[in-house]
Interface confidence: medium
């Protein structure tokens, strides 16, 4: 396996003033090992590996305002350990493909 | 730490429980990329229970195979294509 | 079946620029380091670049022989693999191979390429 | 850069003959965390593309006769062909593969007698 902390960009929208601002962050990103069973059991499902956090802390960023909107502040999670492990559905959005750490619904972004 | 992709790639190797001397039932196995990160809020105003991280992923999968009868009465599978694609069981 | 297949190699004045691309079919290309090796006539090989695989971001790295004169990089949707060769000198003249991961475990046939007067 | 260093250089021998070359790196290729060594041997045959004979020192790649062997850890290394055969003729490379700079031994020439 070759799951791993990795630098990447987050963008964090700043709905009423429609813009972004991009921050730099640690998150997961790697291969994992799997295996589909050529006997399957229903009684006994394999579960598949997805490299995700092992442990994760929350920061907190200000964002900044515009005309009518004050300065606000947004809590993020950060990851700070990885490992190929089962995806938490609880705390975790389970998907083949998602938006992205970067997306963003408006056009202006701020550094 | 060494500098290499060191998963093997999701490539079809034999699977030694339910092969037999030339009759060998060949299984998908290897890595495939996967990686998670803050849910984005366009994401997060879609949810009818909110989830702080995504995490996207992909498995090492049958993309075809053969159903086959062996030892035992046992139906199993016999992988004949790999690819990396959506995982089934990879929630907890 | 993997398979690694050069071109663009040729005869080239020494000053001049040169592509090479390498063609890959049979995995998935974006899972796996790349690199390209040369060998010079008669003499051994040598590494001098590679781009990581899109774990890693595609990041490269390159021998001091020919660091700020080739620059590698894929165009990902059609799995290939450039080598852009800038300010060509003689000792550049070799057979240039591609080949996948970093324990080389596939190779191309090679190109070759002259840089001479 | 982690030197790498063959010898011997050339070696001629005869069909049937059991021969070792030798690689020795100038830093140790072992990783401590899952205990292998990142080391590869190639064989290049006249007019051909190298081909990938042994992986992690000792590992044989799919394919590849058993009479090829590796061995060595650390910073020592060694390639056995137990039996010679004629189409064994080629140059033998050693190469790193813990850290960039990649970088290949300088190679040993399998002659026939």
């Known amino acids: 396996n070759s799951c791993e902390l990795t630098n990447i960009t987050i963008a964090i929208e700043k709905e009423e003033c429609r813009f972004c601002i991009s921050i730099n962050t640690t998150w997961c990103a790697g291969y994992c090992y799997t295996r589909d069973l050529v006997y399957k059991d229903p009684a006994r499902p394999k579960i598949q590996k997805t490299c995700t956090f092992k442990e994760l802390v929350y920061e907190t960023v200000r964002v900044p305002g515009c005309a009518h909107h004050a300065d606000s502040l947004y809590t993020y999670p950060v990851a700070t350990q990885c490992h190929c492990g089962k995806c938490d559905s609880d705390s975790t959005d389970c998907t083949v493909r998602g938006l992205g750490p970067s997306y963003c619904s408006f056009g202006e972004m701020k550094e | 730490a060494p500098d290499v992709q060191d998963c093997p790639e999701c490539t079809l190797q034999e699977n030694p429980f339910f092969s037999q001397p030339g009759a060998p039932i060949l299984q998908c196995m290897g890595c495939c990329f996967s990686r998670a990160y803050p849910t984005p809020l366009r994401s997060k105003k879609t949810m009818l229970v909110q989830k702080n991280v995504t995490s996207e992923s992909t498995c090492c999968v049958a993309k075809s195979y053969n159903r086959v009868t062996v030892m035992g009465g046992f139906k199993v599978e016999n992988h004949t294509a790999c690819h990396c694609s959506t995982c089934y069981y990879h929630k907890s | 079946e993997v398979k690694l297949v050069e071109s663009g190699g040729g005869l080239v004045q020494p000053g001049g620029s040169l592509r090479l691309s390498c063609a890959t079919s049979?995995?998935?290309?974006?899972?796996?380091?790349m690199e390209w090796v040369r060998q010079p006539p008669g003499k051994r090989l040598e590494w001098i670049a590679a781009?990581?695989?899109?774990?890693?971001?595609?990041?490269?790295e390159y021998s001091a022989s020919v660091k700020g004169r080739f620059i590698v990089s894929r165009d990902t949707s059609q799995s290939i693999l450039y080598l852009q060769m800038n300010a060509l000198r003689a000792e550049d003249t070799a057979i240039y191979f591609c080949?996948?991961?970093?324990?080389?475990?596939?190779w191309g046939q090679g190109t070759l390429v002259t840089v001479s007067a | 850069d982690i030197v790498m260093s063959q010898s011997p250089s050339s070696l001629a021998v005869s069909v049937g003959e059991k021969i070792t070359m030798s690689c020795k790196s100038s830093?140790?290729?072992?990783?401590?965390?899952?205990?292998?060594?990142?080391l590869a041997w190639y064989q290049q045959k006249p007019g051909q593309s190298p081909k990938l004979l042994i992986y992690?020192?000792?590992t044989r790649e799919s394919g590849v006769p058993d009479r090829f062997t590796g061995s060595g850890s650390g910073t020592d290394f060694t390639l056995t062909i137990s039996s010679v055969k004629a189409e064994d003729l080629a140059v033998y490379y050693c190469?790193?593969?813990?850290?960039?700079?990649?970088?290949f031994g300088g190679g040993t020439k399998l002659e026939i007698k």
């Open positions: 049979g995995f998935t290309f974006s899972d796996f380091y």
């Open positions: 080949a996948r991961d970093a324990r080389f475990a596939y």
């Open positions: 190469q790193q593969y813990y850290s960039y700079p990649r970088t």
């Open positions: 830093q140790s290729l072992l990783y401590s965390s899952n205990q292998k060594n990142y």
């Open positions: 992690w020192a000792s």
């Open positions: 781009s990581r695989n899109k774990a890693k971001d595609y990041t490269t």
